[in-house]
């Protein structure tokens, strides 16, 4: 299983904030030096950006609005989870409700738990407001049980 911790979710309310045009998502801990084989822990994260308006552009990955917001959020998570275990995010999507962001975070197995994912994200809210002009609230984090490192059995592991 992706994590040894019990699967649970946490939810908090608070504010913090969007926008900049930064080149996307590479940092020193996101370096391209080869890494050892390891398991991966996945965490589902949902939050509101209350100072942005949802429109149909956020349903289309080819639009500038979608790509700029994804780039900002990707860069933001690199800043939040600077420790070596953060791999990146996955399957980001945007929903109505100002803008609701839903995504999956990937970490090297054993480097973080669901509580710390949420705590570190909440601690970054003020900086998110000043650096990216993103007002963040309604944060929810949960484990995603998925046997990423299991390679035996009758399935067809890729």
């Amino acid at each position: 299983t992706p994590t040894t911790l019990a699967s649970h979710s946490t939810k908090t309310d608070a504010s913090s904030t969007h926008h900049s045009s930064v080149p996307p998502l590479t940092s020193s801990n996101h370096s391209t030096s080869p890494q050892l084989s390891t398991g991966v822990s996945f965490f589902f994260l949902s939050f509101h950006i209350s100072n942005l308006q949802f429109n149909s552009s956020l349903e289309d990955p080819s639009t500038d609005y979608y790509q700029e917001l994804q780039r900002d959020i990707s860069e933001m998570f690199l800043q939040i989870y600077k420790q070596g275990g953060f791999l990146g995010l996955s399957n980001i999507k945007f929903r109505p409700g100002s803008v609701v962001v839903q995504l999956t975070l990937a970490f090297r197995e054993g480097t973080i738990n669901v509580h710390d994912v949420e705590t570190q994200f909440n601690q970054y809210k003020t900086e998110a407001a000043s650096r990216y002009n993103l007002t963040i609230s309604d944060v929810s984090v949960s484990d995603v049980p998925f046997p990423f490192s299991a390679q035996s059995g009758a399935g067809v592991p890729g």
Epitope: L25, H30, Q67, S90, N91, K93, V144, F148, G158
Partner: antibody, heavy 118, light 107 residues
């Protein structure tokens, strides 16, 4: 332990609708963040991502095929379905499903070969 | 859609050779690139994700590197069992796209 198996008609004629089923075990599509993608590969050629369905029934499609694709799921039966309308010979391929908690694919089904032939 | 241009298409090799495959993205994808191996009649197998992370059980002769638009996949010492087709994939944004493949062949 994750397993996946695709099934389809094998052979169908041009202009017909292709219906594919992905049956899986080892994960649940009711889990937040989970999803399943369909990917296809014409014989001897490259891979083409087709569609993705999320746990909450949100859907994504390849823009080049969007008007012909329809993805759906039956969470309780651990199945995901893909329909492709108005098929022609260019749709002849092996069709794979893969779970997508990540946007890369550590697990694939064995694939099902679909041949479109008059 | 992001185009992944993969080269070369064919790569003649001998056992023990060091081989390199490159993939170039039509726009920046950060380090969101995966590499797969596919043998005839089999499904693709994940080797590398996030540009440089080896999947569980993948031998350390397989490595990946790169960021932004330019990515490299290397086999440090080719073994007979490595003869296969290799694909890159950008997993940054929908629609996920793959390179056209590189086939390793006996020299």
């Amino acid at each position: 332990q994750i397993t996946l198996k695709e099934s389809g008609p094998g052979i169908l004629q041009p202009s017909q609708t292709l219906s594919l089923t992905c049956s899986f075990s080892g994960f649940s599509l009711s889990t937040s963040g989970m999803g399943v993608s369909w990917i296809r590969q014409p014989s001897g050629k490259g891979l083409e991502w087709l569609s993705h369905i999320y746990w909450d029934d949100d859907k994504r499609y390849n823009p080049s095929l969007k008007s012909r694709l329809s993805i759906s799921k039956d969470t309780s039966r651990n199945q995901v379905f893909l329909k492709i309308t108005s098929v022609d010979t260019a749709d002849t391929a092996t069709y794979y499903c893969a779970p997508g908690v990540s946007s890369w694919f550590p697990y694939w089904g064995p694939g099902t070969l679909v041949t479109v032939s008059a | 859609s992001i185009v992944m241009t993969q080269t070369p298409k064919f790569l003649p090799v001998s056992a023990g050779d060091r081989v390199t495959v490159t993939c170039k993205a039509s726009q920046s994808v950060g380090n969101y690139v995966a590499w797969y191996q596919q043998k005839p009649g089999q499904s693709p197998k994940l080797l590398i994700y996030f540009a440089s992370n080896r999947y569980s059980g993948v031998p350390d002769r397989f490595t990946g590197s790169g960021s932004g638009t330019d990515f490299t996949f290397t086999i440090s010492s080719v073994q007979v069992e490595d003869l296969a087709v290799y694909f890159c994939q950008q997993h940054y944004i929908f629609p996920y796209t793959f390179g056209s493949g590189t086939k390793l062949e006996i020299k």
